[in-house]
Interface confidence: low
């Protein structure tokens, strides 16, 4: 019949000794087991393993000579007048000539004054920005309109209101050089035009800064 | 009335000069740009360049670069062209035209003087 | 520069015809074509602005159309005044540039 396994280790076990002391007396049982001993020191480093894949593309970076804290000079001017008070309806408010540095910048222009309009019928006036004799295409016309209705007409009397207003915008696409930068007063399509005013009693600017892409 | 009203025209040898005047009335220059629009006979119509009499700056069309000159004195609400180095096919009507409130739009045109430049 | 293509360079037409005249712009200009008449010995004269508005004292029957490229000048009932050369031009961008014209003669 067949030795229970442990039965066989301890038969094993008990041979050893035997074998092991031959002539002397044997072997208690095992103490407990000691303590982990220290760390040893480390091993020999392995061989490098095989390359890694390509990581992502990372992002576009720039050439630190073109950064904008490296080479960006501001570049900016304004034009400004004490009393416009400029009563045409049709026709250009007041320019201002800028330097443009480079062909790939966006200008920002800004104009800042009194605008009124005053009519006893519907009317609409428009104020719009000109860079060297046209409008922005790049990539819209930069413009504020005012329109007013009275409504009553038989009330033979008109609001005049003059308050300070800004026409502001980017305008890309304009070429290196000198700008001729101004503002408009013109007409609104399909409105009849009305009284309109420009710059009464405060001061009025033109702000125009040269922006890069 | 706004009116434009040119002077200045007549025959010119090549390579030589000429100064044509555009007096306005009816409005100020200095409230509006100035063009100057050329048609030489039996074709269309061709731009030649402006001035903002306001400050001065002024634009060419790249076949008068260099050649011609826009001036305006406002105190006379006049703008001038200067033609130097005049060419056979400069030969034109040339108009002086008023953009006012639309958009580089010529509202107001003179009527014309008719420059020859032929030996 | 924007190039403007007219067409057709002339035509002839009666009293009281229906006129159409194209113009063709080389790049996009939005609405910003206008249309002008000129009469021989004479200055242009300023029909239509921002393609479809007609400027003061221009009689109703002329008309305009298109944006982008393509742009029309419509004359709705054509009178013996109207007899003439009509412009296209783009005030789009600097430098402002024509169409070599159309002629409109009497058949």
């Known amino acids: 019949s067949e030795i229970p396994k442990g039965k066989q280790k301890a038969q094993l076990r008990q041979r050893e000794v035997v074998d092991l002391y031959n002539g002397m007396c044997l072997q208690g049982p095992a103490g407990v087991p000691g303590r982990d001993g220290s760390p040893g020191a480390n091993g020999i480093p392995g061989t490098p393993g095989i390359p890694g894949r390509d990581g992502f593309k990372g992002e576009k970076g720039e050439c630190l000579r073109e950064s904008f804290e490296e080479s960006w000079t501001p570049n900016y001017k304004q034009c400004s007048w004490s009393s416009l008070n400029y009563g045409i309806d049709l026709g250009k408010i007041a320019e201002c000539t800028f330097t443009k540095m480079r062909s790939n910048s966006a200008l920002r222009v800004l104009f800042s004054g009194s605008l009124r309009l005053k009519c006893r019928n519907a009317c609409c006036q428009r104020w719009y920005f000109t860079f060297n004799g046209a409008e922005c295409s790049g990539p819209l016309p930069i413009e504020a309109i005012i329109y007013l209705d009275q409504g009553s007409p038989e009330m033979n009397s008109t609001i005049n209101i003059h308050r300070t207003s800004s026409v502001e915008g980017l305008c890309e696409g304009i070429g290196a050089g000198l700008v001729d930068v101004a503002i408009w007063v013109g007409t609104c399509s399909d409105y009849p035009k009305g009284d309109a005013s420009t710059g009464w009693n405060s001061v009025s600017r033109i702000i125009i800064e040269e922006l890069p892409k | 009335e706004v009116q434009l009203v040119e002077s200045g025209g007549g025959l010119v040898q090549p390579g030589g000069s000429l100064r044509l005047s555009c007096a306005a009335s009816g409005f100020t220059i200095s409230g509006s740009d100035i063009h100057w629009v050329r048609q030489a006979p039996g074709k269309g119509l061709e731009w030649v360049g402006r001035i903002s009499p306001y400050g001065g700056n002024t634009n060419y069309a790249d076949s008068v670069k260099g050649r011609f000159t826009i001036s305006a004195d406002t105190s006379k609400n006049t703008a001038y062209l200067q033609m130097n180095s005049l060419r056979a096919e400069d030969t034109a009507v040339y108009y002086c035209?008023?953009?006012?409130?639309?958009?580089?739009?010529?509202?107001?045109w003179g009527q014309g003087t008719l420059v020859t430049v032929s030996s | 520069d924007i190039q403007m293509t007219q067409s057709p360079s002339s035509l002839s037409a009666s009293v009281g015809d229906r006129v159409t005249i194209t113009c063709r712009a080389s790049?996009?200009?939005?609405?910003?074509v206008a249309w002008y008449q000129q009469k021989p010995g004479k200055a242009p004269k300023l029909l239509i602005y921002s393609a479809s508005f007609l400027y003061s004292g221009v009689p109703s029957r002329f008309s305009g159309s298109g944006s982008g490229t393509d742009f029309t000048l419509t004359i709705s009932s054509l009178q013996p005044e109207d007899f003439a050369t009509y412009y296209c031009?783009?005030?789009?961008?600097?430098?402002?540039?024509f169409g070599q014209g159309t002629k409109v003669e009497i058949k």
């Open positions: 031009q783009q005030s789009y961008t600097t430098p402002p540039t």
């Open positions: 790049q996009d200009v939005s609405t910003a």
């Open positions: 035209a008023r953009v006012g409130g639309l958009k580089l739009l010529f509202d107001y």
